[in-house]
Amino acid sequence: MREVTVACSETADLPCTAPWDPQLSYAVSWAKVSESGTESVELPESKQNSSFEAPRRRAYSLTIQNTTICSSGTYRCALQELGGQRNLSGTVVLKVTGCPKEATESTFRKYR
């Protein structure tokens, strides 16, 4: 499983590891997977048409700003083919190191 390690308070960029076809378009959603189930990650739709452009390989990636120890964990991306039937998913593990004991909530955003 893909692992991304960042220092506390830094920005983490989590790649969507689903086997997506670059010649198709998808709607993406991210969830944090926990022992008690899954917790949805809020991704503002206003970010869909962001003026910032990332490389094609970073389409559907999740950016977590100001990471804390609470940001650590397993994340799952789900891709739904637009106008199609296929649903794809991938997982990535985030490890946040060097955090002080007190943690604050993280903020999320995505590309495209």
């Epitope: 692992e3 830094e10 790649p15 969507c16 490389p55 094609r56 390989r57 970073r58």
Partner: antibody, heavy 118, light 110 residues
């Protein structure tokens, strides 16, 4: 079969402009980012710039202003103004990693040689 | 700027040995890091993509690891055919970049 191939390399004199062409087949340029890279004899790989699937372009800081990347439906061009002897190199066109598992999308052409000499 | 520093510039290793090549990014690039092998007169050949995923047809003797700013390519059970120059390439961003490639590491097999 998917492929990329560079053309247009030749012997030129300093100050000459030149356009190199990368012809692609088997895939759509509207879905992939395409890069130009060069390699001087006996030297390392030097990134020139990229044109995204969307058409946006980015250049190495040293290449801005003198190199221009553009594309049509099946070609990616690299236009160079006023060549110098330091531009002597093999120029490669490559399709960038598309970001999905199982097939990385990387694809390189054999390169085209540009020699600048008086 | 996102600069890639690759070490060592050159290394000599015996057949059957192991070589480790390091690549350091000046800023975090997550896992958007690829490794290439290049032999004289040929275009680069992809070995590892996304820091640790083995490209199709590449032997498992090649292993990539790392994330953030520190990355490693390890080649074990070295063969004569592994003599080549190896490059890392970041794919995180193309804005404010001098070169997406590291300087290269020449591997000489004794």
């Amino acid at each position: 079969c998917q492929s990329v191939e560079e053309s247009g390399g030749r012997l030129v004199t300093p100050g000459t402009p030149l356009t190199l062409t990368c012809t692609v087949s088997g895939f759509s340029l509207s879905s992939y980012d395409m890069t130009w890279v060069r390699q001087a004899p006996g030297k390392g790989l030097e990134w020139i710039g990229i044109i995204y699937a969307s058409g946006s372009t980015y250049y190495a800081s040293w290449a801005k202003g003198r190199f221009t990347i553009s594309k049509t439906s099946t070609t990616v061009d690299l236009e160079v103004t006023s060549l110098t002897t330091e531009d002597t190199a093999t120029y490669f066109c490559s399709r960038e990693h598309a970001g999905y598992s199982g097939d990385t999308g990387h694809l390189w052409g054999p390169g085209t040689l540009v020699t600048v000499s008086s | 700027a996102y600069d890639m520093t690759q070490t060592p510039a050159s290394v000599e290793v015996a057949v059957g040995g192991t070589v480790t090549i390091k690549c350091q990014a000046s800023q975090s690039i997550s896992t958007y890091l690829d490794w290439y092998q290049q032999k004289p007169g040929q275009p680069p050949k992809l070995l590892i993509y996304d820091a640790s995923d083995l490209a199709s047809g590449v032997p498992s003797r090649f292993k990539g690891s790392g994330s953030g700013t520190q990355f490693t390519l390890t080649i074990s059970d070295l063969e004569c055919a592994d003599a080549a120059t190896y490059y890392c390439q970041q794919g995180y961003t193309h804005s404010n970049v001098d070169n997406v490639f590291g300087g290269g590491t020449e591997v000489v097999v004794k």
